[in-house]
Amino acid sequence: QKSSIEKCSVDIQQSRNKTTERPGLLNCPIYWQQLREKCLLFSHTVNPWNNSLADCSTKESSLLLIRDKDELIHTQNLIRDKAILFWIGLNFSLSEKNWKWINGSFLNSNDLEIRGDAKENSCISISQTSVYSEYCSTEIRWICQKELTPVRNKVYPDS
Amino acid sequence: QKSSIEKCSVDIQQSRNKTTERPGLLNCPIYWQQLREKCLLFSHTVNPWNNSLADCSTKESSLLLIRDKDELIHTQNLIRDKAILFWIGLNFSLSEKNWKWINGSFLNSNDLEIRGDAKENSCISISQTSVYSEYCSTEIRWICQKELTPVRNKVYPDS
């Protein structure tokens, strides 16, 4: 006699064979906060940007990617303390002389009003009220994200 | 009338409330290869180590973490060409003067026989036959991993 969960595994596997999607997150893991179609994890410890990226990766997640001003504001509303900074998945690409998201796309200049310099070894942090350029070696908190709802036929080509 | 998949969503959500696990991958996404309890994605493009880490992260996966010699050999068996190098999730920590996995753990010296220097800006690549220390700026392929089976009560504290 199969449990309902085991039966589900079969159902979802059969569904995947038709849709080539991964099951995805149906709701957020414990300790993660839902914000629309994402799950966010606000770290309690501090790290330089690179270690923050690594931490999110080992959690099978990404440093926060912000689509637009609206998402920025909604994320900032979850930050309780005005003075705390959190790394997101945006840093300065020296070769391309531009702000680059870790998914390879460039920052749309209208999306975020960045305070500070656009230069080598600069990474982006957000606070409750602002977006800052900081040295990537600065040890602050960070935000990881997971996509909550699976996208049909989502595949993973190289960046 | 709910579809079997929608019913499953409810069942799995109810199950999660009891076990605090995330649904996890039931099988590997398209283009990913199963190796035991992991899904692996071998890139077809090249990148420095840092960009490879970012790429895996945006795919909600991790640069490959290798538990032991046995897993290394099984992974190497999937590499077709003797000369091609792939980044894994291991680099040299200057502050700790040791090889460090991106999940924060240190390399067990018996696990991998590394050819090359343990020094600043060194990252680890694997080939079909060996494990090499290379400059992290070297542009080679990389391997991302996703855990295939969920672990009961798996939570995500900070590293």
Epitope: L94, S95 | T45, V46, P48, K82, A83, I84, L85, F86, R115, G116, S125, T129, S130, E134, Y135, S137, T138, E139, I140, R141
Partner: antibody, heavy 122, light 108 residues
Amino acid sequence: QVQLVESGGGLVKPGGSLRLSCAASGFTFAQYYMSWIRQAPGKGLEWVSYISPSGSTIAYADSVKGRFTISRDNAKNSLYLQMNSLRAEDTAVYYCARSLMATGTHLYFDLWGRGTLVTVSS
Amino acid sequence: DIQLTQSPSSVSASVGDRVTITCRASQDISSWLAWYQQKPGKAPKLLIYAASSLQSGVPSRFSGSGSGTDFTLTISSLQPEDFATYYCQQVTSFPPYTFGGGTKVEIK
């Protein structure tokens, strides 16, 4: 057709400058380490310089360091070698060469151009 | 810098002969070695990489072996189109990427 075509060679006086170009076609240029290799008349092969796929890492042979500059334009599928302060001993056929993909800085040259002759003489 | 010494510097052979060329490195280069063939007025052609891997499109009569400091290129049965100069090259990840002095294979 997968190929590399060099241009820009010629006769130049000692102390002069020359810019070599290499046009790549038939492959994804931006994914490969590219090099310049030269061969003096009747002599063996000498590696001159390499550039990484993104252009972020560059290396030179000691014999040309400070005088030659390698660069690339991935949008134009082109590789360049700017040669300044040329000497008689720089006289050679200059080849543009592609390295096997994903072998990093272990440069196995799997595709070569036909070469362009640079003659440095007064 | 790593020096590569090829021997012999020239060899006279006939069609059908087995020809062996050696390359000795001044220090351990693991398997980071390539072999090239060059004909007069032409660019070199990659034959063998990673000491023993045959490059795509290269006839199977060519083979490479060795690791560390001693390497061999073997042509099992010499063909008319094989008369050329052969170079070894070390490709450890640190420049310069030195070539051997070359071995000329001539018709006996």
